[in-house]
Interface confidence: low
């Protein structure tokens, strides 16, 4: 499965958009893990609404957001106040029972150095900024310049 | 100003290795990906790789992957070209470019080193 | 990979007139959830690397002269130079920036009738 680089500046929020088959995976719960090593298991950050019908409301655990939007085949994930320490890879996953299918690999990437004036505001960022099939980012500012890495076919 | 400049290009037999740098001013280097684009003399533009602003992730084109490493010195707002195993076909001026900033453009690049050559013969 | 295939190989244009290139991509870089084109265009002077000047296919870069424009979606793509200049005469390729790996178009050579 393809894997999406996401960069995002430490301190800002990182919103990252997985979208999926609405009818594939009608009725099925979303989640966001972080998978520990290459070939290690995938650590459960935080899942939508135990009741599918209610998986558009935020849920939250601590500085990780998510809400599914059903109808649009599209939940999201918010990262907010990013940090060193959330850089590493994450999956986006269907529930099915026991069973979680990998709809997106995303590979976070925390910068920590704030961009000079000169290179703010040369490119425009708009609010809901995406990136790339399977994968979105929004960043809390528009002065961001970081290029997404899409995904490999 | 964006500056890009390239060295480290020259003549190699086949087999052979072959470093290229590209020195990087005028904008804050750790904060962009970059990448390495060739042309053969003659031909058209080829990508050859691409390296995220951390160095955390990278990217190959198959006519290069496990042959070329692509890396970098943000202290030194340097990238690195190692080209090991090298080929006739590796012939080519290869070009250190900036990925335009912004995360919903993609990887377009913008601006573009004057280029190295580098001749892959015996 | 995305195919990227260019027409004509090479085209001649009088000084004025209008100067088209074709560019087909083998799948979509139409990015739904934006609806945009990861399409970009480049001039190659003789001599000179490369420079940018159209991404998201019809999004020219600052500082290009709006005589070049583009145009198109989905697999099929058009860059207009419409009053060519002698400063326009160059290798013209084009570019998906949609998905890696990155792959250009032939190029299309450009010169004065």
């Known amino acids: 499965l393809n894997t999406t680089v996401l960069q995002g500046m430490a301190g800002q929020s990182l919103r990252v958009s997985c979208t999926y088959d609405a009818l594939k995976h009608w009725g099925r719960r979303k989640a966001w893990c972080r998978q520990l090593g290459e070939e290690g298991p995938c650590q459960r950050v935080v899942s939508t609404h135990g009741v599918w019908l209610l998986a558009f409301l935020k849920k939250r655990n601590g500085s990780t957001v998510i809400a599914d939007d059903t109808l649009a085949g599209t939940v999201t994930i918010t990262l907010k106040n990013l940090q060193a320490g959330d850089a590493g890879l994450y999956q986006c996953q269907s529930l099915r029972g026991r069973e979680a299918e990998v709809l997106q690999k995303v590979l976070v990437e925390v910068l920590e150095d704030p961009l000079d004036d000169q290179d703010a505001g040369d490119l425009w960022v708009p609010e809901e900024s995406s990136s790339f099939e399977g994968a979105q980012v929004e960043h809390s500012t528009s002065r961001n310049q970081e290029t997404s890495f899409p995904p490999t076919s | 100003e964006v500056q890009l400049l390239e060295s480290g290009g020259g003549l190699v037999q086949p087999g052979g290795s072959l470093r290229l740098s590209c020195a990087a001013s005028g904008f804050t280097f750790s904060n962009y990906a970059m990448s390495w684009v060739r042309q053969a003399p003659g031909k058209g533009l080829e990508w050859v790789s691409a390296?995220?602003?951390?160095?955390?992730?990278?990217y190959y084109a198959d006519s290069v992957k496990g042959r070329f490493t692509i890396s970098r010195d943000n202290s030194k707002n340097t990238l690195y070209l190692q080209m090991n195993s090298l080929r006739a076909e590796d012939t080519a001026v290869y070009y250190c470019a900036k990925l335009r900033g912004g995360y919903e453009v993609g990887p377009t690049f913008d601006p573009w080193g004057q280029g190295t050559l580098v001749t892959v013969s015996s | 990979d995305i195919v990227m295939t260019q027409s004509p190989d090479s085209l001649a244009v009088s000084l004025g007139e209008r100067a088209t290139i074709n560019c087909k991509s083998s799948q979509s870089v139409l990015y739904s959830s934006n609806n945009k084109n990861y399409l970009a265009w480049y001039q190659q002077k003789p001599g000179q690397p490369p420079k940018l000047l159209i991404y998201?296919?019809?999004t020219r870069e600052s500082g290009v002269p709006d005589r070049f424009s583009g145009s198109g979606s989905g697999t099929d793509f058009t860059l207009t130079i419409s009053s060519l200049q002698a400063e326009d005469v160059a290798v013209y390729y084009c570019?998906?920036?949609?998905?890696?790996?990155?792959?250009f178009g032939g190029g299309t050579k450009v010169e004065i009738k």
């Open positions: 390296i995220s602003g951390s160095g955390g992730s990278t």
């Open positions: 998201w296919a019809s």
């Open positions: 570019q998906q920036h949609y998905i890696w790996p990155i792959t």
